[in-house]
């Protein structure tokens, strides 16, 4: 495929990546694969600057993020690295509360109304952003 | 038992602010959320929002954002829903649901299962 | 905004009668519903949950079912205790919306 040079419609260029912002909620992991399906994947945020960016974007509005510990330890959804990675949590998060009686704990993360981040049950329809990066091979054919 | 005790009827009047409360009891409160309905009279159900007590996130409905705040205290297991700039339209009974997402196989559903008696809030200059 | 909305308005029915009441979503919203009973001067009391699951100590006469778009609240032989006023709440995404709801009373 070609690398692609520009973001699609209605897409946001912001440092070499494309970010789109929805207007609607979905549970986590159904967010997680409408980004797949387009080509792109649940924003991972990797710089103060990046965050503000989002943050302005989606406003004071609970917005899912590609970071999640299903499987036990903290992951983007991309590979990122969190141990050594940009964190931004609300005070004492995530604390991956049991309390709601699910079974399993909060495992999904979103920028709350403050931008911060938080931990919760991850079936919450939020709003959610993909980003995709412009250097990224596109899987569309090259054209001739 | 479980039970959502609401505080008494308010009469406001337009531009003032009104705060109602919901004192939960008979289970853990901070593992439900608490949600706020209102019902004018003779009308329908209108859902303002949600806050989860464990933390005091909150989710509110766009029309009644910038209007509407919902806040708790634990220690007294009472949640509160606080609506400024009153007019007339807000006049109607204003309800407290305990929710939360339950488990059935592997769907996941939100259930409302217990409501408070309901708050009736008039604004009348 | 989901919008959901729901017919009949109202009907009358006598005692025994099969009732039927039908719930539409403007989107697909799964079987992300519930059914909601409230009678004057009283807070709604739930029913149904993910459009067919029946609540602990609802009688078994109140049956939902639907997916998608579609969905039906069937009360099998209406019992005096039953002339309410019933709404569905999605639930898919927020804001979770009321149906203006359907008021059954005696005929």
């Known amino acids: 495929g070609s690398e692609r040079t520009c973001c699609p419609v209605n897409w946001v260029e912001h440092e070499r990546s494309c970010y789109w912002f929805s207007r609607s909620g979905k549970a986590w992991a159904d967010a997680d694969n409408y980004c797949r399906l387009e080509d792109a994947h649940l924003v991972v945020v990797t710089s103060w600057e990046e965050q503000k960016f989002v943050q302005h974007h989606i406003g004071p509005v609970n917005t899912w993020m590609g970071l999640h510990d299903q499987n036990g330890p903290w992951k983007w959804v991309d590979g990122t690295d969190y141990e050594t990675g940009f964190k931004n949590w609300r005070p004492e998060q995530p604390d991956d509360w049991y309390g709601h009686g699910l079974g399993g704990g909060e495992d999904c993360a979103h920028f709350t109304d403050d931008g911060r981040w938080n931990d919760d049950v991850c079936q919450r329809p939020y709003r959610w952003v993909c980003e995709t990066e412009l250097d990224k091979a596109s899987q569309e054919p090259p054209l001739l | 038992q479980v039970q959502l005790e609401q505080s008494g009827a308010e009469v406001k009047k337009p531009g003032a602010s009104v705060k109602v409360s919901c004192k939960a009891s008979g289970y853990t409160f901070t593992s439900y959320d608490i949600n706020w309905v209102r019902q004018a009279t003779g009308q329908g159900l209108e859902w303002l929002g949600w806050m989860n007590p464990k933390r005091g996130n909150t989710g509110y409905a766009q029309k009644f954002q910038g209007r509407v705040t919902m806040t708790r205290n634990t220690s007294i297991s009472t949640a509160h829903m606080e609506l400024s700039s009153l007019r007339s339209e807000d006049t109607a009974v204003y309800y407290c649901a305990r929710g939360r997402y339950s488990r059935e196989d592997y769907y996941y559903y939100y259930d409302m299962d217990v409501w408070g008696q309901g708050t009736t809030v008039t604004v009348s200059s | 905004d989901i919008q959901m909305s729901q017919s009949p308005s109202s009907l009358s029915a006598s005692v025994g009668d099969r009732v039927t009441i039908t719930c539409r979503a403007s989107?697909?919203?799964?079987?992300?519903l519930g059914w909601y009973q409230q009678k004057p001067g009283k807070a709604p009391k739930r029913l149904i949950c993910?459009?067919?699951r029946l609540q602990s100590g609802v009688p078994s006469r109140f049956s939902g079912s639907g997916s998608g778009t579609e969905f039906t609240l069937t009360i099998s032989s209406l019992q005096p205790e039953d002339f309410a006023i019933y709404y569905c709440?999605?639930?898919?995404?927020?804001?979770?919306?009321f149906g203006p709801g359907t008021k059954v009373d005696i005929k």
């Open positions: 989107q697909g919203i799964r079987n992300d």
């Open positions: 709440l999605q639930h898919h995404d927020y804001p979770f919306t």
């Open positions: 993910a459009a067919s």
